[in-house]
Interface confidence: medium
């Protein structure tokens, strides 16, 4: 939109863009007559002035209170009040390259950084955070205690879609042939908990065996799942009659 | 007045890496609103524009001699631009300047002329 404060439109004397040019592209002054780099997040825009251009598409121009801190309108004794260009859509996308980004804005940013080192474009794959598989941030560890005692395995794991946490015990037969049991079955020694937490998209599960018996020895899973993949991690816990059978390092992480 | 001041060169085997570093300083002078830019300048030639970097670091420019092989980035925390050069070759031997142009928005800026603020250079000698 034109100002009050423009005047005439003389193409001659606009002042020349720079020789590399804009990498948000071209757009006309607040006059609507010189082209001027677009404007990017941070950056100011409106006003009257030559040079105070409009915002890269995706964005717009807003009023901001605040001075740009430690960026150029402070510097150059701008007005208390600036106009800066904000991003348009203020969620979280999901680019091709799997990274999740705060804005689109700031994905077009990452993919033209990208093409600028000779690297393939960033592309916005769906909005919201990039889904992922499950992973064990916090495996279970291998437990040593006495028949009789308390014990509990936890397990923490990560995914988006937040995923879904189950405890199976693996089962040999003579012949090596593997089965898995899911938890707790109808085992009343025998606990499951599981909460959110305690970071975003995160699960954390305990199996809690209270008393333990030999029967309760044994490989123990966590398996989680969502809709991007499952992951699993496991542990033993080995029963003895007596706490000096117990050894006193039985590999990294076994605990009483 | 304000000093750029370029650091990090060398004498460097084909092949190898440098990341050189420019740190600026001065009065009233506000870092993360100057554009930044690397120069070289090797006997017998012109200076030559080899890399720029937008005020916030978000965008940035590489001519074809360097695309690929180096890397622009500035920490505005620290009034510092860097730039990594890797697999150096005998023709990259020069001296490396960086330099500094006001700027609010994102621009790129190439020509010597453009730029207000110069350092005094870093010497880079790659051996065959």
């Known amino acids: 939109s034109s100002s009050d404060a423009c005047g005439p439109c003389v193409p001659a004397s606009c002042p020349a863009l720079p020789r590399l040019g804009c990498p948000l592209g071209e757009t006309r002054d607040a006059c609507g007559c010189c082209p001027v780099c677009a404007r990017g997040e941070g950056e100011p825009c409106g006003g009257g002035a030559a040079g105070r251009g409009h915002c890269a598409p995706g964005m717009e121009c807003v009023k901001s209170r605040k001075r740009r801190k430690g960026k150029a309108g402070a510097a150059a004794g701008g007005p208390a009040t600036l106009a800066v260009c904000v991003c348009k859509s203020r969620y979280p996308v999901c680019g091709s390259n799997g990274i999740t980004y705060p804005s689109g804005c700031q994905l077009r940013a990452a993919s033209l950084r990208a093409e600028s080192r000779g690297e393939k474009a960033i592309t916005q794959v769906s909005k919201g955070t990039c889904e992922q598989g499950p992973s064990i941030v916090t495996p279970p560890k291998d437990i040593w205690n006495v028949t009789g005692a308390k014990v509990f395995l936890s397990c923490e794991v990560i995914g988006i879609p937040t995923p879904v946490l189950i405890w199976n015990k693996v089962k040999r037969d003579h012949s090596g042939v593997q089965r898995t049991e899911l938890l707790p079955g109808d085992r009343e020694n025998l606990a499951i908990q599981t909460r959110g937490g305690p970071e975003k998209h995160e699960v954390t599960g305990w199996v809690l065996v209270s008393p333990l018996s030999k029967e309760d020895a044994g490989e123990y899973e966590c398996h989680a799942s969502n809709s991007q993949g499952q992951a699993s991690a496991a542990a033993k816990i080995t029963v003895v009659d007596a706490l000096h059978e117990i050894p006193l390092k039985k590999g990294e992480g076994a605990q009483l | 007045s304000v000093q750029l001041q370029e650091s990090g060169g060398g004498l460097v085997q084909t092949g190898g890496s440098l990341r050189l570093s420019c740190a600026a300083s001065?009065?009233?002078?506000?870092?993360?609103?100057?554009?930044m830019g690397w120069f070289r300048h090797a006997p017998g030639k012109e200076r030559e524009f080899l890399t720029a970097?937008?005020?916030?670091?978000?965008?940035?420019y590489y001519t074809d001699s360097v695309k690929g092989r180096s890397t622009i980035s500035r920490d505005n925390a620290k009034n510092t631009v860097y730039l990594q050069l890797n697999n150096l070759k005998p023709e990259d031997t020069a001296v490396y300047y960086c330099?500094?142009?006001?700027?609010?928005?994102?621009?790129?800026?190439?020509?010597?002329?453009?730029?207000?603020?110069w350092g005094q250079g870093t010497q880079v000698t790659v051996s065959s």
């Open positions: 330099a500094a142009k006001f700027s609010q928005v994102s621009a790129f800026f190439a020509t010597v002329s453009e730029y207000e603020y």
């Open positions: 001065g009065r009233s002078f506000t870092f993360s609103s100057y554009a």
């Open positions: 970097i937008t005020w916030s670091g978000d965008y940035t």
